[in-house]
């Protein structure tokens, strides 16, 4: 291919040549595919709003928890158990948290009057000891509450534990109270203020609209837009029991989903609230179930810093805001339509698949002979022939052979390796249908050419009886008119070919051979048809006429132009043409592959 290209190469357009098949079946299949695909494309376009440019939500959240709880605490004072009533308000049970979260305390364990000094550890498997050998000075166990002094001291009675430097008395290892001390937190309410923004669409809104009844409480069906939630209802929605979760604590997700259609003609932008338990409720005791943390209230007593340590159990509510805002965008629409156009090619792919399958050799040889109802599918072979043009790779070894006593053409695509071309079986190829329009272009003279001396004027049919083999004709010759090749030994086998497969009359004896191949008048006409002002000397003319005769024979016997290029002429025909249009001196070169 040339490296440079002219201006005319730029201004050109290529398109495919198509085959239109008039078929009720395939027409129905095509429209069925097109209707289904068109319906799906339109449905997806509308239902998923694929004509919109979508943008994720940007949001801010603010919460307010309301409610009062009465707590009945059991405390031990001077060895006597006492029940103490206290009231907890928002400031007592909520803690400032970062991000979109708020925390509600539901249970707690208190260790009062702690100060920094030496004291025995609380008895556990890891802190109990029988001698000082079980304690190590300076040792800090991750589970411990202080730094060991290396002494094993009496904790209570005959229990001895390692002494530590820590906040004393050490916090007891005990279970969270049951039921939870702030069980009534179930009735607390939380107001969630959520402002959202779609900067790309220049749109801002919030979940609390003007005119909202602020005494409402959220209900999934009766009041789904109310931003005030009762904590117990949140747990009921997820199928959990608030009282059970309140003992150890947990994490609850409040999901706010904004699916906003910002088109003027279908404007809709309201939140959908849903709830999800986020902590692992099946956690093993050893893996710290629930949700808890410790915090301390510090104070001074007699100038000694003391603290009350509180282990707080409660529920952390995480507010998860997500969603998208979409607005009509012509580019999105064009991109979507473009991406779906290829689906319309599925009909063609499917129909081509059917044609290719039903016209395969497998169907022809195994299915059609036995399955009568499959017979109508044979028409696919016709469609296939019209649709596809099969070409063989033009290898140097490619040759086509035509015997007058066989209806098909043989394709030989192998090296002969010393064997006569006559004896090589090759592959059977159907003979192309004759295009009689080509004949009509031949001169009228073809029909009234003067007879060649010594031959009768009427058309001769090939004689049925075999021609007696001449003494000179080679072993492979079946017509008795072939001559040995003059080519070197290595190339000779290529010319060892007769016009027949079985013994019989030679094709050169037919009237048509004489009129189509040997008629100087016809051949000169064909040469002038190609080059009107052709003027050649006798020898050159003979050469041109000889090669034109070869071409005429190949076109006549092989039909297809592609096959004619690789056609090998039988020896009898070759020598008959050479006799008519001889070379003044030198050898004949024989067949040369055109590529």
């Amino acid at each position: 291919m040339p490296a440079c290209c002219s201006c005319s190469d730029v201004f050109q357009y290529e398109t495919n040549k198509v085959t239109r098949i008039q078929s009720m079946n395939y027409g129905t299949i095509k429209w069925f595919f097109h209707v289904i695909i068109f319906s799906y494309v339109c449905f997806a376009l509308v239902s998923d709003k694929l004509y919109q440019r979508k943008e994720p939500v940007i949001s801010s959240v603010h919460t307010k928890v309301k409610g009062i709880a009465e707590v009945k605490e059991e405390i031990v004072e001077n060895g006597v158990k006492k029940l103490v009533h206290s009231v907890f308000d928002t400031a007592d049970y909520t803690f400032p948290l970062q991000g979109n979260s708020f925390f509600v305390m539901t249970n707690f364990l208190k260790t009062e009057g702690q100060e920094q000094r030496l004291c025995p550890e609380y008895p556990t498997r890891r802190t109990l000891c029988s001698s000082d050998r079980g304690c190590k000075k300076g040792w800090m166990d991750p589970q411990s509450k202080g730094i060991q002094t290396g002494r094993c001291v009496v904790y209570e009675g005959n229990q001895k534990t390692c002494e530590v430097s820590a906040w004393c008395p050490i916090e007891a290892v005990e279970e969270a109270p049951r039921p939870a001390l702030l069980n009534s937190a179930e009735n607390f309410t939380v107001l969630i203020k959520n402002n959202i923004d779609f900067p790309g669409h220049n749109y801002t809104t919030r979940n609390i609209l003007p005119g909202l009844n602020i005494t409402c409480t959220f209900h999934k069906t009766q009041n789904p837009q109310c931003p005030i939630f009762r904590l117990g209802d949140i747990f009921r929605e997820t199928g959990d029991n608030f009282s059970d979760v309140a003992i150890q604590g947990g994490i609850m997700g409040i999901e706010i989903y904004w699916d906003c259609n910002l088109d003027r003609w279908f404007h809709h932008c309201r939140p959908k609230y849903s709830f999800r338990r986020l902590d692992d409720k099946t956690t093993n005791v050893s893996l710290y179930p629930g949700y808890n943390f410790r915090y301390a209230k510090y104070y001074k007593e007699n100038n000694v810093e003391k603290r009350t340590l509180i282990k707080v159990f409660g529920i952390r509510f995480d507010i998860l805001v997500f969603g998208t805002g979409g607005k009509f965008d012509i580019i999105q629409l064009v991109v979507y339509i473009g991406s779906t156009l290829s689906y319309f090619g599925l009909a063609a792919v499917f129909i081509d698949f059917l044609i290719d399958t039903y016209s395969s050799n497998c169907c022809r040889s195994h299915i059609y002979p036995w399955c009568k109802c499959c017979q109508p599918c044979v028409v696919n072979e016709y469609y296939y022939r019209k649709k596809c043009e099969s070409i063989v790779e033009p290898k140097p070894t490619l040759k086509y052979v035509s015997f007058v006593d066989e209806s098909h053409i043989r394709m030989v695509n192998q090296q002969l390796l010393g064997r006569s071309l006559q004896d090589v079986k090759g592959q059977e190829v159907p003979r192309p249908a004759m295009d009689f329009t080509d004949l009509s272009r031949l001169p009228l003279a073809l029909h009234d050419t003067p007879p060649i001396p010594g031959q009768p004027e009427e058309i001769q049919l090939l004689r049925k009886e075999a021609t007696p083999r001449s003494r000179d004709s080679p072993v492979w010759c079946q017509c008795g008119s072939c001559l040995p090749s003059q080519l070197p030994e290595s190339h000779r086998c290529l010319e060892e070919l007769c016009c027949r497969k079985k013994p019989g009359a030679c094709i050169t004896t037919s009237e048509l051979f004489r009129k189509l191949v040997l008629s100087r008048h016809v051949l000169q006409f064909l040469l002038l048809y190609q080059e009107p002002l052709l003027a050649l000397d006798v020898d050159s003319t003979n050469s041109r006429l000889r090669h034109c005769a070869y071409r005429c024979y190949a076109t006549w016997r092989f039909g297809s132009q592609d096959m004619a290029d690789f056609a090998i002429l039988p020896s009898c025909c070759r020598w008959r043409i050479r006799k008519e249009f001889p070379k003044s001196e030198g050898q004949y070169s024989g067949f040369k592959s055109p590529y």
């Epitope: 498997r125 000891c129 029988s130 050998r133 166990d141």
Partner: nanobody
Framework: DVQLVESGGGLVQAGGSLRLSCAAS????????MGWFRQAPGKEREFVAA???????DYGDSVKGRFTISRDDAKNTVPLQMNSLKPEDTAVYYC???????????????????????WGQGTLVTVSS
């Protein structure tokens, strides 16, 4: 949970040897520190030897140099090889296991009976003079 079964106890002459074995059931055996304790009639339970899940060992003062503890995690066994036995070694020997899944038992606490959650039924060792 882990079940422990001791074997190999019996009567032996002073100066002789004996090999006790503790077989443990449970797939997580390799996460346990294993110990041998003994209790002579009318006395406190006394530490003999222990081996942590990562192979460090500790011995009671009275058995150092004579007893050897090891572990075979493939067979879930903890053998105790007792050599140069003395009449004062006569006692019921108990095998014990301490879970180290959530934190290893510090070496200096391998001798503490409080660290061990699971105990075997014991095997009697009698050393005659």
């Amino acid at each position: 949970d882990v079940q422990l079964v001791e074997s190999g106890g019996g009567l032996v002459q002073a100066g002789g040897s004996l090999r006790l074995s503790c077989a443990a059931s449970g797939r997580t055996f390799r996460h346990y520190a294993m110990g041998w304790f003994r209790q002579a009639p009318g006395k406190e339970r006394e530490f003999v030897a222990a081996i942590s899940s990562y192979g460090s060992t500790d011995y009671g003062d009275s058995v150092k140099g004579r007893f050897t503890i090891s572990r075979d995690d493939a067979k879930n066994t903890v053998p105790l090889q007792m050599n140069s036995l003395k009449p004062e070694d006569t006692a019921v020997y108990y095998c014990a296991a301490a879970d180290e899944t959530l934190g290893a038992v510090p070496n200096f606490r391998l001798h503490e009976k409080y660290e061990y959650e699971y105990w075997g039924q014991g095997t009697l060792v009698t050393v005659s003079s």
